[in-house]
Interface confidence: low
């Protein structure tokens, strides 16, 4: 490998390097490559140099495109017709000089917060792009359409948020916002101007016309209308609160919808239970007043007994299935019918046939094994499935099983 690299001179973005050649193993060195490493890089990275290509008889080069105020170390790698050699020992660590910052914060945005607040947020500039000590941010903002910018200086490289609080800030008003950078060398550029809205007021009116219906033992559907009167606060969505009759309201569960959707399904409930429900509108400032409470009772649970005594027989290209009727218990929903689920043994998708009888005739090709199961269904939902029945592929025309 080449001997250790020396840093002869360093500026804010360049470093002049020199090195001594190492042994060439009887094959002349054709070129050198310079690599650099910083506390922020992942291992050693090739860097741009002048000259761009360093031939085997050149032992000095200038590295360009470095970041100001970053600690660098350098090494060289020699190459010949045989291949690439071992890298040299690294140079000493040296820091580039300071310069004005050039990179602006990303994703300047904001919004939300409390009454009379303008919240401005941004992504901090990484340390390796701060270009010097004493890095900080200048936050500039003005009501949309106004001339004068208001400025705030935040002397912290870690700052990523500024909140302007003033009684003059109206709810949900647009502001033009930009964030600039500075360090000990002076001020850098501002980010592009973006529009950020001040904090809004929570909705002031409750939703109207609340209606709930039970879909099954475990599911309820709730409907409502947007507040009838004009809200002072914008509506981002709705919050539905639900609790069982015998529980306290403060132990209620809540679900939120997003946007102008005015219905939702509540799932995973218990069967034959009286629930209370109420709906509120919400936005980033909070929730508005609650609607009137409505009540709904979930349907009885579906039958727990699976279909039994399943018998099948086949003729020609048909399979005929028979099973015993499922009787619902007193606290279960009445059986409305049965679902027969079938699929080829090798196929993942399942086909379903519904019937209100206790038998069904399936037209199925006979060159496949079939997996079949049967379950009752009711107003309370689907009941327990039978065990899976495997009907083997049938080469002759007639077969039967149970």
């Amino acid at each position: 490998p080449p001997e250790a690299v020396t840093i002869d001179e360093i500026t804010d973005t360049t470093a002049q390097l020199s090195w001594r050649p190492g042994p060439d193993n009887h094959s002349p060195i054709t070129m050198y490559v310079i690599q650099a490493r910083t506390p922020f890089s992942v291992g050693w990275q090739a860097v741009s140099t002048v000259p761009e290509l360093i031939d085997g008889k050149t032992f000095t080069a200038t590295v360009v495109g470095l970041n100001p105020w970053v600690e660098y170390e350098f090494r060289t790698v020699a190459a010949n017709v045989i291949g690439i050699g071992e890298p040299s020992r690294p140079s000493e660590k040296r820091r580039t000089e300071e310069a004005l910052p050039e990179v602006t914060p990303a994703n300047v945005s904001g919004g939300g917060g409390s009454k009379s607040e303008l919240v401005i947020t941004w992504e901090t500039v990484p340390e390796e792009l701060q270009n010097g000590r004493g890095f900080g941010y200048v936050v500039a903002f003005r009501p949309y359409g106004k001339m004068i910018w208001m400025l705030t200086v935040l002397a912290s490289a870690d700052a990523s948020r500024y909140v302007f609080r003033n009684e003059s800030v109206h709810p949900f008003s647009p502001f033009e916002v930009k964030v600039g950078v500075f360090n000990n060398k002076g001020e850098g550029p501002f980010s592009p101007t973006t529009v950020v809205y001040s904090a809004e007021e929570e909705p002031t009116k409750p939703p109207a016309s609340i209606f709930a219906r039970s879909l099954s033992a475990t599911d309820i559907e709730v409907f409502w209308a947007s507040p009838l009167e004009k809200n002072r606060g914008r509506i981002q969505g709705y919050e539905v609160k639900y609790w069982r009759h015998e529980d306290k309201e403060e132990n209620a569960r809540k679900i939120r919808t997003v946007g102008n959707q005015t219905s939702t399904k509540i799932t995973n409930l218990k069967g034959s239970v009286l629930y209370h429900l109420a709906v509120k509108a919400y936005n980033s400032a909070g929730t508005g007043p609650s609607s009137a409470t409505v009540n709904v009772t979930t349907r009885k649970p579906p039958p727990s007994q699976p279909p039994g005594n399943i018998i099948w027989n086949s003729s020609d290209s048909k399979i005929i299935l028979n099973w015993d009727q499922v009787k619902a218990l007193d606290n279960e929903s009445e059986v409305k019918g049965y679902k027969v689920l079938y699929r080829w043994n090798r196929q993942s998708s399942t086909s379903v046939i519904e019937t209100n009888k206790t038998s069904v005739e399936l037209s199925l090709p006979f060159d496949e094994d079939y997996i079949i199961e049967i379950k009752p269904f009711s107003d309370g939902g689907d009941g327990s499935s039978s065990e899976q029945i495997r009907i083997p592929k049938i080469s002759n025309a007639y077969a039967r099983g149970s």
Partner: antibody, heavy 123, light 101 residues
């Protein structure tokens, strides 16, 4: 401090009956859903039944439905499990347990457990 | 039905994740040591009851819930059960035996 004390376990023949009791103290008994959970020797936990705070709603595991009845007497702060038509596979330690909240998340939030009472079904 | 791996081991002080798959409206986690009643360590997917060390945490995504123990201690060796409900049926997983090496 919440305390749950089960009693009533013992040896019973297949087809026989047994009534388990659980005396509760240290909390407002009538506000909380209560559970019976069992554990066969060397096996995992198995939910048996749940009853709402007021006693108006009950839920059972399919394996015991129609044979076991969960009930409560809120005036006595006592939970019961009436077990009929007992089978060998009902042999287990039976735990009385309390929901963590007045709202029940079922078996996702059983906060307090008794020490259990052993039921052995054998001829 | 809730499905758990029967056994998991972890080196002392390391992190271990125990999973539970199957549909539930909400998941809870229980620790049970030999000869003792179970103890609730996580309820409603992510919440830790008071008195449970903060090395225990819970999460759920889709039809899978996880219990994570960050920096496992010798006293964490136990059986762990997930519990949940679906409609009108409550259910426990088959349990995972955690060994701390």
């Amino acid at each position: 401090e919440v305390q749950l004390l089960e009693s009533g376990g013992g040896l019973v023949q297949p087809g026989g009956s047994l009534r388990l009791s659980c005396a509760a103290s240290g909390f407002t008994f009538s506000s909380f859903n209560m559970f019976w959970v069992r554990q066969a020797p060397g096996k995992g936990l198995e939910w048996v039944a749940e009853i709402s705070g007021g006693g108006g709603s009950t839920w059972y595991a399919p394996a015991v439905k129609g044979r076991f009845t969960i009930s409560r007497d809120n005036s006595k702060n006592t939970l019961y499990l009436q077990m009929n038509s007992l089978r060998a596979e009902d042999t287990a330690v039976y735990y009385c347990a309390k929901s963590a909240f007045t709202w029940s998340y079922g078996a996702a939030s059983i906060q307090a457990w008794g020490q259990g009472t052993l039921v052995t079904v054998s001829s | 039905e809730l499905t758990q791996d029967p056994a998991v081991s972890v080196a002392l002080g390391q992190t271990v994740r125990i999973t539970c798959s199957g549909s539930s409206g909400s998941y809870g986690w229980y620790q049970q040591k030999p000869g003792q009643a179970p103890v609730l360590v996580i309820y409603d997917n992510t919440n830790r009851p008071s008195g449970i060390p903060d090395r225990f945490s819970g999460s759920s995504s889709g039809n899978t819930a996880s219990l994570t123990i960050t920096g496992a201690q010798a006293e964490d060796e136990a059986d762990y059960y997930c519990g949940g409900y679906w409609g009108s049926t409550d259910v426990f997983g088959g349990g995972t035996k955690l060994t701390v090496l």
